[in-house]
């Protein structure tokens, strides 16, 4: 059906045309699927393209930057958003996405994020690390998320809510499912991946796969000719 | 501990427009995506609508162009705009969000609509 | 969509029997490696609870009562031994692909 090629294969999906196509600008409303409206920004921007970068969420912009719009420190607000510096400590933030890493926001401050003085079960901010195309479940870039989940003694399992691949048990990977991130199985050989073109083209993700698992590279299937070159399929094959 | 209340129920006629809310507590609200789920008076759950810690929203067919979710993470509120009602928009109408897993994990109590001439 | 389909529509178990309710999708909920199944009670003017997530993991605060299997299409969600507070609609809820949607429910009433 057009609901699985579009959001249910496991992979991160490529919708709309990059930026400068047809594609909706950032605020417009995209079709993902059959019954469903995403609205956000474009998602298409590259890291060596036009500053200020464009965003729609934290988790688009890089390792030291929050999206919000250029006036405002919320994320959300109206007007177009891109990425800004984080916030240092003892500065003012609304949320923890906002502070620097190694930070996070309480009481509107950014504070450090030394976990000795959280309580357990204290929910606390912090960033996806993806290492490249072959080892992240996302566009080969450290990004930000703006989900949370809460810190425990033992690492999150299958479906747990994670910010990053080392909140999740071994095995596991932190990628978005729907709305939020969980934890999923990383890729075994053999297994569909999901490479992307270029840096940056992470698409709607409404859905996203772990990376292959260690000794394995996300490659195109030697025995898969598609008329397409966008279409081909790629596995998690040994190096 | 965790609460979500929504309020901004009542009656309303066919065609109208309604607001509800949902006040969040106990959580870092601006960092979690939260969802509207309705319950219809035969006890059907449905999905309304949802929005990611960033803002990005999601609806089904059903209420497309007619609903809009939008939060506030300053005040800790979720919204949910609905205009155009129709009879089958009657419902329990309940906030919720994932805080541990995937899964819907935390309730509001639901506060009723009624689209009735 | 996926549609859910619950059986039986209600049930009337003994007092520490065993209730067994089913859901069937129209299609699998396994993806990721995960089967995004999930249940939920609901007791009179309440709202839902999770009880089950990911086909057999147990949501917070709850009982070892209640288990969650089955992988696919084809799930179960199993009450042992039945207690009184247990008289509630249970719903199954798929989150494998959007929208996500629920089943009809199961009404259980203890004996």
């Known amino acids: 059906t057009l609901n699985s090629v579009l959001i249910n294969s496991n992979a991160i999906k490529n919708l709309p045309p990059p930026l400068g196509g047809a594609g909706g600008q950032p605020g417009s409303a995209v079709s993902v699927a059959p019954g469903v409206l995403y609205e956000g920004g474009n998602k298409y921007q590259t890291l060596d393209n036009y500053q200020p970068y464009p965003c729609a969420e934290d988790e688009e912009c890089g390792t030291d930057e929050y999206c919000s719009s250029p006036s405002r420190g919320a994320a959300g607000v109206g007007g177009v958003q891109i990425c800004l510096a984080c916030r240092k400590r003892r500065k003012r933030c609304m949320r923890h996405a906002m502070c620097c890493p190694g930070n996070y926001c309480k009481n509107g401050i950014c504070m450090p994020s030394d976990h000795s003085h959280l309580p357990r079960g204290e929910i606390e901010e912090g960033i996806i690390e993806n290492l490249g195309n072959d080892h992240g479940a996302g566009d080969g870039y450290p990004r930000r998320t703006t989900l949370t989940s809460k810190i425990y003694h033992t690492k999150g399992q299958e479906g747990s809510v994670c910010l990053r691949s080392s909140d999740c048990a071994t095995g596991l990977c932190c990628a978005r499912h729907f709305w939020s991130k969980i934890c999923k199985p990383v890729l075994k050989e053999g297994q569909v991946c999901t490479k992307h073109r270029r840096k940056g083209s992470h698409g709607l993700e409404i859905f996203q796969r772990c990376y292959c698992g260690e000794g394995l590279a996300c490659r195109i299937q030697k025995d898969h000719h598609q008329t397409s070159n966008s279409s081909r399929l790629h596995t998690c094959q040994r190096h | 501990e965790v609460k979500l209340v929504e309020s901004g129920g009542g009656l309303v006629k066919p065609g109208g427009s309604l607001k509800l809310s949902c006040a969040a507590s106990?959580?870092?609200?601006?960092?979690?995506?939260m969802s509207w789920v309705r319950q219809t008076p035969e006890k059907r759950l449905e999905w309304v609508a949802s929005?990611?810690?960033?803002?990005?929203?999601y609806y089904p067919d059903s209420v497309k162009g007619r609903f809009t979710i939008s939060r506030d993470n300053v005040r800790n509120i979720l919204y949910l705009q609905m205009s155009s009602l129709r009879s089958e928009d009657t419902a329990m109408y309940y906030c919720?969000?994932?805080?541990?897993?995937?899964?819907?994990?935390?309730w509001g109590q639901g506060t009723s609509i009624t689209v009735s001439s | 969509d996926i549609v859910l389909t619950q059986s039986p529509a209600s049930l009337a178990v003994s007092l520490g029997q065993r209730a067994t309710i089913s859901c069937r999708a129209s299609?699998?909920?396994?993806?990721?490696?995960?089967?995004?199944m999930n249940w939920f009670q609901q007791k009179p003017g309440q709202p839902p609870k999770l009880l089950i997530y990911?086909?057999?993991k147990q949501g917070s605060g709850v009982p070892a009562r209640f288990r969650g299997s089955g992988s696919g299409s084809d799930f179960s969600l199993t009450i042992h031994p039945v207690e009184e507070d247990d008289t509630a609609m249970y719903f199954c809820q798929q989150s494998k692909e959007v929208p996500p949607t629920f089943g009809g429910g199961t009404k259980l009433e203890i004996k």
């Open positions: 919720a969000t994932s805080l541990e897993n995937y899964a819907m994990d935390y």
């Open positions: 990911a086909a057999s």
């Open positions: 929005i990611s810690g960033g803002g990005d929203t």
């Open positions: 106990g959580f870092t609200f601006s960092n979690y995506a």
């Open positions: 299609e699998s909920v396994d993806d990721f490696g995960i089967s995004f």
